[in-house]
């Protein structure tokens, strides 16, 4: 079981009883980690591992964990209040405009171009012309020296549904 | 092209009401979750609450929750938010927003979501 699991994240059916807690909704919503019954009346926990709610709600099932595809790692599992998080494998990355699959990144920069940046889970390798030190998409880096690529935005949960 | 238009913000006492509503271009509406978030002068964007593509059941910030209710029409492509029982930090321009493709089914951080509209401002004073 991983380290990042503690006793908050565990739905009460992990503590204790095995039967799903039931609660009552507060001003008509469920806190995270629950949904609402149908007649509105109880809240239940979602079961860990298998659902979830990150915000209150009143959604009728919790939301189902993402399963990691191939080619992703697992960051971090899928609790009763948080989805699993995924990231592209080492060699691979999730563009923003595209995130629904992890691509190759490129192996080495066009003819005129060095690299100036690495490939992360999040990113491509970055190239800039050597001459002018413009960047392949035609920005023009602040310093002219080398540029270091930054460690980027946090890991995002993955975005194929199992 | 997305094109996403708020309406509906203005200025209320604090207490009031106001329905913020956002008409969507795209014929992917129906089948999309969306969401409303906030941007008060000097702070971030924050999410307020997001609602399934079917309409049935939804996500609320703690900060609003029982204040404000979220709904969609999907024949009309219409997303609303009931605003009630207004503070002073509600005060903030409001933006409705349609998730990237593939993103979770119901997507609640500003990075989940590409297409926005333009906001509409809300200001809550006395």
């Known amino acids: 079981e991983s380290a990042l699991i503690t006793q908050q994240d565990l739905a009460p059916q992990q503590r204790a009883a095995p039967q799903q807690k039931r609660s009552s909704p507060s001003e008509g919503l469920c806190p995270p980690g629950h949904h609402i019954s149908e007649d509105g009346r109880d809240c239940i926990s979602c079961k860990y591992g298998q659902d979830y709610s990150t915000h209150w709600n009143d959604l009728l099932f919790c939301l189902r964990c993402t399963r990691c595809d191939s080619g992703e790692v697992e960051l971090s599992p899928c609790t009763t209040t948080r989805n699993t998080v995924c990231q592209c494998e080492e060699g691979t990355f999730r563009e923003e405009d595209s995130p629904e699959m992890c691509r190759k990144c490129r192996t080495g920069c066009p003819r005129g171009m060095v690299k100036v940046g690495d490939c992360t889970p999040w990113s491509d390798i970055e190239c800039v012309h050597k001459e002018s030190g413009t960047k392949h998409s035609g920005e023009v880096p602040a310093v002219e020296e080398t540029v270091t690529s930054s460690p980027g935005t946090p890991a995002s949960p993955c975005s194929l549904s199992g | 092209e997305v094109q996403l238009l708020e309406s509906g913000g203005g200025e209320v006492q604090p207490g009031g009401s106001l329905r913020l509503s956002c008409a969507a271009s795209?014929?992917?509406?129906?089948?999309?979750?969306v969401g409303w978030f906030r941007q008060a002068p000097g702070k971030e964007r924050e999410f307020v609450s997001a609602?399934?593509?079917?309409?049935?059941?939804?996500y609320y910030a703690e900060s609003v929750k029982g204040r404000f209710t979220i709904s969609k029409d999907n024949a009309k492509r219409t997303l609303y938010l009931q605003m009630s029982s207004l503070r002073a930090e509600d005060t903030a321009v409001y933006y409705c927003?349609?998730?990237?493709?593939?993103?979770?089914?119901?997507?609640?951080?500003?990075?989940?979501?590409?297409?926005w509209g333009q906001g509409t401002l809300v200001t809550v004073k006395p």
């Open positions: 795209v014929s992917t509406f129906g089948t999309s979750p």
């Open positions: 609602i399934r593509w079917d309409g049935v059941g939804a």
């Open positions: 927003a349609l998730p990237r493709r593939g993103e979770s089914e119901l997507p609640s951080t500003v990075k989940e979501y590409g297409y």
